[in-house]
Amino acid sequence: QHHGVTKCNITCSKMTSKIPVALLIHYQQNQASCGKRAIILETRQHRLFCADPKEQWVKDAMQHLDRQAAALTRNGGTFEKQIGEVKPRTTPAAGGMDESVVLEPEATGESSSLEPTPSSQEAQRALGTSPELPTGVTGSSGTRLPPTPKAQDGGPVGTELFRVPPVSTAATWQSSAPHQPGPSLWAEAKTSEAPSTQDPSTQASTASSPAPEENAPSEGQRVWGQGQSPRPENSLEREEMGPVPAHTDAFQDWGPGSMAHVSVVPVSSEGTPSREPVASGSWTPKAEEPIHATMDPQRLGVLITPVPDAQAATRRQ
């Protein structure tokens, strides 16, 4: 695959507010050709956020991630990290991207493309050594509700990229820019491949603390912040949802006041969501700031799963 080095394929229109470095696993600068410099941050949920490189918290986060990567390299020359057993699960969890980011992959595949890999979702996590971003579609396994955008707390509102969850293959946007300025920190998860006949919801799960060094991916999400609203108990979970055809433009976790237009051409039309309606063509939730991403229809190998707005989810009173 040819990688164009100059084309800007990640454009940030607005920047996130502070995110604790404890929740981040990777960062990358966008290309110089993008004009406006930005840092693309990846969280443990594989959601991507644009951040202002001039802000002190961003500088500190990058420095911290660089140190972490250097420590990993020193401790064995690999970025692999044990995070306990991550058992194969039956449902994918979505990665995500900031809605303020515009992805501009070329249909020729010369720049960046949405490219399915033959590996399973867990294998992709175990392999995840590519230093290139974004990888909003390499999901962590497990079921989680989408978080409420941090409106009440002055947090990252309306700054997350759209989510494109993996299915059986884990797709990755291949960034055309070399990873800079710091070393890659793709914290990997070892997976236990032993199949389980037990229902995942009743299956006992285990995690052991690793040899001393931080282990990274996958953080639980809640759909509310303390002092705002109670915890949902019976909200929809990802594993309750059926597959969604790839031709839908269904995105989730839009912050207040945002708009999406994503041109995605169908590769299949099987499967319907069990809970949520899915629009075909363009879908514009809570309009304000546009995102436009065009993807090569030949390379589109993921399903896009809608998740109900967390604010509208059933809440426990």
């Epitope: 996130t16 502070k18 995110i19 604790p20 470095v21 404890a22 929740l23 969280t43 443990r44 959601r47 956020f49 002190q56 918290w57 500190d60 911290h64 995070i83 306990g84 991550v86 058992k87 699960r89 969890a93 962590s140 396994s141 497990g142 079921t143 989680r144 509700l145 978080p147 409420t148 955008p149 941090k150 707390d153 002055g154 947090g155 990252p156 998860a189 919801s201 799960s205 285990t206 995690a207 603390s209 931080e214 282990n215 991916p217 996958s218 953080e219 639980g220 999400q221 809640r222 759909v223 509310w224 912040g225 303390q226 915890r231 949902p232 108990e233 019976n234 909200s235 979970e237 426990r316």
Partner: antibody, heavy 122, light 107 residues
Framework: EVQLVQSGAEVKKPGATVKISCKAS????????IHWVQQAPGKGLEWMGW????????KFNERFEGRVTITADRSTNTAYMELSSLRSEDTAVYYC???????????????WGQGTTLTVSS | DIRMTQSPSSLSASVGDRVTITCRAS??????LAWYQQKPGKAPKLLLY???TLAEGVPSRFSGSGSGTDYTLTISSLQPEDFATYYC?????????FGGGTKLEIK
């Protein structure tokens, strides 16, 4: 109402292993992190690690040197913290807690269990 | 690891007093700080978190301030139920760390 109910006090000998339970109710157990925090007598609080029952992901404080294992039974909404190779300095109250935030907010602890006292003595 | 240093370690005050507890981090924590109150034999209770947001059900006499590495918890007018031990916790980076605690006693 969100509640975390922990198992009762334990007395163990040095070198033994203890397993403390934390039963959650009032929210979707698999979606939110369970944290474990140690408080030695007359001392402050020390974070041991977090664990997400939904996908078995976890992160631990290096200080516990691989002695901590966390398990969960999703059918009963119960998390377990196992501490092995016990020594006298492990004598403490152990709390489970949950963090309320989405992944951009961070891990502060809004709900706590009542605590489980562990005494390690020969 | 980020070390959290709380001061004073103990404090005597009277009902109605204004009290300030400080917490200093060994590195910048970007306001990712929480304050907890703990009474003897009980679990800690969340008071404030990120950017000095008051937790649900916490009286408005509790407030927080600070930035960078230095933070303060202020109780504007002490009530009898406020006598307890207070802890700060940073959650900017792991391992998450707590201050050593400030024991607030009745004068």
């Amino acid at each position: 109402e969100v509640q975390l109910v922990q198992s009762g006090a334990e007395v163990k000998k040095p070198g033994a292993t203890v397993k403390i339970s934390c039963k959650a109710s009032g929210y979707t157990f698999t979606n939110y992190n369970i944290h474990w925090v140690q408080q030695a007598p007359g001392k402050g609080l020390e974070w041991m690690g977090w664990y997400l029952p939904g996908d078995d992901s976890s992160k631990f404080n290096e200080r516990f040197e691989g002695r901590v294992t966390i398990t969960a039974d999703r059918s009963t909404n119960t998390a377990y913290m196992e501490l092995s190779s016990l020594r006298s300095e492990d004598t403490a109250v152990y709390y489970c807690a949950t963090s309320p935030t989405d992944e951009t907010q961070g891990d502060y602890f809004d709900y706590w269990g009542q605590g489980t006292t562990l005494t390690v003595s020969s | 690891d980020i070390r959290m240093t709380q001061s004073p370690s103990s404090l005597s005050a009277s009902v109605g007093d204004r009290v300030t507890i400080t917490c200093r981090a060994s590195g910048r924590i970007h306001d990712f700080l929480a304050w907890y109150q703990q009474k003897p034999g009980k679990a800690p209770k969340l008071l404030l978190y990120t950017d000095n947001t008051l937790a649900e059900g916490v009286p408005s006499r509790f407030s927080g301030s600070g930035s960078g590495t230095d933070y303060t918890l202020t109780i504007s007018s002490l009530q009898p139920e406020d006598f307890a031990t207070y802890y700060c916790q940073q959650f900017w980076s792991t391992p998450y760390t707590f201050g050593g605690g400030t024991k607030l006693e009745i004068k």
